[in-house]
Interface confidence: low
């Protein structure tokens, strides 16, 4: 799926109001030190591409994701706000509800999720330009924020 | 816990160069902005410049243009702040500051203790 | 350049008093942060976004504004609250207001 044609102030926005706070309800009791952020992502339709796949491929050691709460609730945002986003995930969907058999909270999960709140952090806030003395020109620091 | 320890206090003289540490610690490093401030005796803060520790993209603000280089280095989640060319009025508290932006607005929520430059011949 | 403006630059008032602190900008902004400073200190978040206290901060601190225009008050003054305190906008770079010094009386 290509999310370059997204809402990404609407998704945000649903990232900020309910999603980060689950991400933290289920790395709760982890440091956050704990894990090393691996993954990363250069601009907004590619992170949105590294989140759903760690989300909702299952991978070696977590394939329990996609019944999580911050799961359902990206899956909703990314259907509303990305374009034909709903149709693309028939398929996909019902291959994981095969798949799954138990909610199992793995270390590997827990690492898998630490990945997930680092690319929804770049999301959230994309890089600065290497961009020299420069004005600030942070493209994404002249949108009109969201509340918590 | 987020910590960001910066190194000693210098005394340069006019048109030398300084170069200021800040170690972070408790967070991971290239998650986050990091902004240089700095502020004289009795004056208010000036923000001098931002930089993200994952890609090394800067910004600067444009009074210290040419003067004032920022730089990091990753494997030591270490930040510098290196301004040249000095004068007496660069005599001041230099503080390197963490911006978390999973707070909206994008705020400087943990702060280094300062390091004092003093400029004089 | 946005430029953040502070007033007053002084304000002397008793423990138990109510402070209102004015912080405009030259140009609308999205939000605006708040941090105290104590001598010899570091300056320290105070609020967040306009009107999210942070960390540790006594709910009788609270943030309101939009725009051009914001305001910090503190309803009733506590010892431990004189200090100089900060606004800074993050829109156009970094900018910080000249700061309001809260006084003893």
């Known amino acids: 799926y290509d999310f370059t044609n997204c809402d990404f102030e609407k998704i945000k926005a649903a990232y900020l109001s309910t999603i980060s706070k689950d991400l933290i309800t289920y790395m709760s009791g982890t440091k956050s030190t704990e894990f090393n952020n691996t993954v990363s992502c250069s601009n907004r339709p590619h992170c949105l591409t590294e989140i759903q796949s760690l989300t909702f491929n299952p991978t070696a050691g977590c394939a329990s994701l996609a019944k999580e709460m911050f799961a359902m609730k990206t899956k909703a945002a990314l259907a509303i706000w990305c374009p034909g986003y709903s149709e693309t995930q028939i398929n996909a969907t019902q291959a994981m509800k095969k798949a799954r058999k138990s909610k199992v909270t793995t270390n590997k999960c827990l690492e898998q999720v630490s990945q997930l709140q680092g690319l929804w952090r770049r999301f959230n806030r994309p890089l600065l330009k290497q961009q020299g003395s420069s004005d600030y020109k942070d493209d994404d620091d002249k949108h009109h924020h969201h509340h918590h | 816990e987020v910590q960001l320890v910066q190194s000693g206090a210098e005394v340069k003289k006019p048109g030398a160069s300084v170069k200021v540490s800040c170690k972070a610690s408790?967070?991971?490093?290239?998650?986050?902005?990091m902004n240089w401030v700095r502020q004289a005796p009795g004056q208010r803060l000036e923000w001098m410049g931002i930089i993200s520790p994952y890609n090394g993209g800067t910004s600067y603000n444009q009074k210290f243009k040419g003067r004032v280089t920022l730089t990091v280095d990753k494997s030591a989640s270490t930040a510098y702040m290196e301004l040249s060319s000095l004068r007496s009025e660069d005599t001041a508290v230099y503080y390197c500051?963490?911006?978390?932006?999973?707070?909206?607005?994008?705020?400087?929520?943990?702060w280094g203790q300062g390091t004092t430059v003093t400029v004089s011949s | 350049e946005i430029v953040l403006t502070q007033s007053p630059a002084t304000l002397s008032l008793s423990p138990g008093e109510r402070a209102t602190l004015s912080c405009r900008a030259s140009?609308?902004?999205?939000?605006m942060h708040w941090y105290q400073q104590k001598p010899g200190q570091a300056p320290r978040p105070w609020i967040y976004a306009t009107s999210n206290l942070a960390s540790g901060v006594p709910a009788r601190f609270s943030g309101s504004g939009s725009g051009t225009s914001y305001t910090l008050t503190i309803s009733r003054l506590e010892p431990e609250d004189f200090a100089v305190y900060y606004c800074q906008q993050s829109d156009s770079g970094r900018e910080f207001g000249g700061g309001t010094k809260v006084e003893i009386k």
């Open positions: 140009s609308s902004v999205s939000y």
């Open positions: 408790g967070y991971t490093f290239t998650d986050d902005y």
């Open positions: 500051a963490r911006e978390d932006y999973d707070y909206d607005g994008y705020a400087m929520d943990y």
